[in-house]
């Protein structure tokens, strides 16, 4: 699917903004009048909703934050414009719960369905004499099965909410003014502090800092990172080493250990938190590879770990090689996904930033057009991706990376060998059958690995419904550190890929992400998308979410534009 559209935006079948005529098959169009076709606001034909449909039944649901409908009948709504509805009623004698499909354009029990586009059925109280009456409507599969009476963002009185906003808005004006003043003062203090830090790094002004072109100076670092951007992408050639105090060990890899550390400033109390990657003497080659990659000023990007400097250090244990970078407290993506379930919005941010980071790495120019050496990572995996405070990704660990220098010969490329982590290796890497004539082949292996990481993110997203414990790709099929041979069995012999359960596809955005990652892990490297294309697709997703004006964090779709018609 989508092979002819690999380098574009969403394939046509994913873009919702098509005309009706182009969406209905010609052989069906002939006999269908347009008034029988139901479309969404953008002209996409709608699939019908799947809803619980038990009409009115007695219920035991009372004084609870949420209840299950206990309705065993799921119906395909007769008309595709219909949404799921639940009505809870309590009078002196009994409690009833009604579950139905209904057209939101028509009142139900004399009330308009205001929340029909919501993915959840959040009950709102309605005024009915002689009884307590709650109603909700929603637009995701069987969403009226779980009826919610209490949600943080729910209010039973929208008018009251408006009054609260108005009152708090007016009363907050004076403190808001004070707050803005404080921020400005703090900003000035920070700028002054950053300049002091820069001078610490300069040691006698013997070193000129590399600069961005003035037309393109963009601050790309994490907005909560303490590192001065002026310090980035430098090799510390001075004999005087930075005043760094190692704190705790935060990670251990094949070649090095990573420490959280304090970079001291002029006064002993002040420090910046940094990360220090320490390579033992024997791993000089890995340190040099990563140092050389990081030394390229054009590599600087918000989704690539911010590099500060590299140092050679003599200790009582012998010579060590240090890389000093920004520190990200949330840790790596694998740890983060193990500990946290993520929302749809988080998934979009994490996925988008990952794709942008890889696209920048692969690109032969910077965002502002300066020539740049394309780089392939060759060991992309969730433990080599850091999560920043704003819940975006940045790539790290370039120890196996390769600069795609146009002067490299096929022999040079061949000598780079089968590198990476077996679990994340593309089929052609496992098979050692890469097309070395084409440097794009290296990028295509990164894209395959990226697809597996996107799958990991999706597997922990609560917008799909039930979320299982974190499991790495192929987690149920291979042991913890699989060898190349066992991955060959899975990926080459069985053409296996991580499972995409069908219920993930109930969410429109996640369906798009799944379509994308499926194209990224295609067996045929040529058929895979580019990282840039994936980044553009994520931008498109954000655009679609904004256009439809929904809170995208958990939006589910009835599953797709669907077609049902009046009978």
């Amino acid at each position: 699917m989508g092979r002819g559209l690999l380098r574009g935006l969403w394939p046509l079948h994913i873009v919702l903004w098509t005309r009706i005529a182009s969406t209905i098959p010609p052989h069906v169009q002939k006999s269908v009048n347009n008034d029988m076709i139901v479309t969404d606001n953008n002209g996409a034909v709608k699939f019908p909703q799947l809803c619980k449909f038990c009409d009115v039944r007695f219920s035991t649901c009372d004084n609870q934050k949420s209840c299950m409908s206990n309705c065993s009948i799921t119906s395909i709504c007769e008309k595709p414009q219909e949404v799921c509805v639940a009505v809870w009623r309590k009078n002196d004698e009994n409690i009833t719960l009604e579950t139905v499909c209904h057209d939101p354009k028509l009142p139900y029990h004399d009330f308009i369905l205001e929340d029909a586009a919501s993915p959840k059925c959040i009950m709102k109280e309605k005024k009915k004499p002689g009884e307590t009456f709650f109603m909700c409507s929603c637009s995701s599969d069987e969403c009226n099965d779980n009826i919610i009476f209490s949600e943080e963002y729910n209010t039973s009185n929208p008018d009251l909410l408006l009054v609260i906003f108005q009152v708090t808005g007016i009363s907050l004006l004076p403190p808001l003014g004070v707050a803005i003043s404080v921020i400005i003062i703090f900003y000035c203090y920070r700028v002054n502090r950053q300049q002091k830090l820069s001078s610490t790094w300069e040691t006698g002004k013997t070193r000129k800092l590399m600069e961005f072109s003035e037309h393109c100076a963009i601050i790309l670092e994490d907005d909560r990172s303490d590192i001065s951007s002026t310090c980035a992408n430098n090799i510390n050639h001075n004999t005087e080493l930075l005043p760094i105090e190692l704190d705790t060990l935060v990670g251990k890899g094949r070649f090095a250990e990573v420490y959280k550390a304090k970079l001291k400033q002029n006064t002993s109390e002040q420090f910046e938190t940094v990360a220090v990657k320490i390579f033992p003497y024997e791993e000089y080659a890995s340190w040099k590879t990563e140092k050389d990659i990081f030394s390229d000023i054009n590599l600087k990007h918000e989704n690539i770990l911010q590099f500060l400097t590299a140092e050679e250090r003599k200790t009582e244990l012998g010579k060590q090689y240090w890389l000093i970078t920004a520190f990200h407290a949330k840790g790596n993506l694998q740890e983060y996904l193990t500990r946290h379930v993520i929302s749809w919005e988080d998934l979009r941010k994490l996925g988008s930033s990952l794709a942008r980071g890889i696209a920048h790495l692969h690109s032969d120019h910077t965002p502002c057009g300066r020539p740049k050496m394309p780089i392939v990572h060759r060991d992309l995996k969730s433990s080599n991706i850091l999560v920043k405070n704003d819940l975006t990704c940045c790539l790290c660990d370039f120890g196996l990376s390769l600069r795609l220098d146009p002067t490299l010969s096929v022999d040079d490329l061949a000598n780079s060998g089968q590198v990476g982590t077996a679990r994340y290796m593309a089929p052609e890497v496992l098979e050692s059958r890469m097309n070395l004539e084409n440097v794009e082949s290296f990028k295509q292996t990164d894209v395959y690995s990226m697809a597996l990481v996107l799958w990991e993110m999706t597997s922990r997203c609560n917008a799909v419904g039930e979320v299982k414990d974190y499991e790495p790709p192929f987690g149920s099929k291979v042991r913890e550190h699989p060898c190349v041979e066992s991955m060959k069995d899975n990926v080459l012999r069985d053409r296996g890929r991580p499972e995409i359960p069908s219920f993930w596809l109930n969410h429109q955005g996640i369906q798009m992400v799944c379509e994308t990652l499926t194209e990224c892990w295609d067996h045929d490297p040529e058929a895979r998308l580019t990282a840039q294309c994936v980044a553009e697709r994520f931008s498109e997703l954000e655009h679609l979410d904004r256009l439809s004006g929904r809170s995208c964090s958990e939006e589910k779709i009835p599953e797709d534009g669907s077609l049902n018609t009046t009978k």
Epitope: M1, I14, V45, S502, Q511, T518
Partner: nanobody
């Protein structure tokens, strides 16, 4: 390229049975909900039945509940519709459809005629 090919239609007497098949190719079949949709002569489209990607969940329109059974064989990339106790009003062209974000993945349809 996504392809869906329906077969199994034909002329049957009221009360009779038919089994429709839909052979799918060009996409990862197991990842998608699939639908059977029908269109009676001069009428609109009616969604008959749906089945989840793994086949564990099935859904039916009220008009066919208890008479039709949807199933799938993911190893063969094939969708089925077993139709029993057929009625004259079941006469229609039956299409299988891949659940997706637009409406371009349909087969050519197979005609089912229920008549005595």
């Amino acid at each position: 390229e996504v392809q869906l090919l329906e077969s199994g239609g034909g002329l049957v007497q009221p009360g009779g049975s038919l089994r429709l098949s839909c052979a799918a190719s060009g996409f990862t079949f197991v990842n998608y909900r699939m639908w059977w949709v029908r269109q009676a002569p001069g009428k609109g489209l009616e969604w008959v039945s749906a089945i989840s990607g793994s086949g564990d969940k099935t859904y039916y329109a009220d008009s066919v509940k208890g008479r039709f059974t949807i199933s799938r064989d993911n190893s063969k990339n094939t969708l089925y519709l077993q139709m029993n106790s057929l009625r004259a009003e079941d006469t229609a062209v039956y299409y299988c459809a891949k659940h997706g974000l637009s409406f371009d993945y349909w087969g050519q349809g197979t005609l089912v005629t229920v008549s005595s």
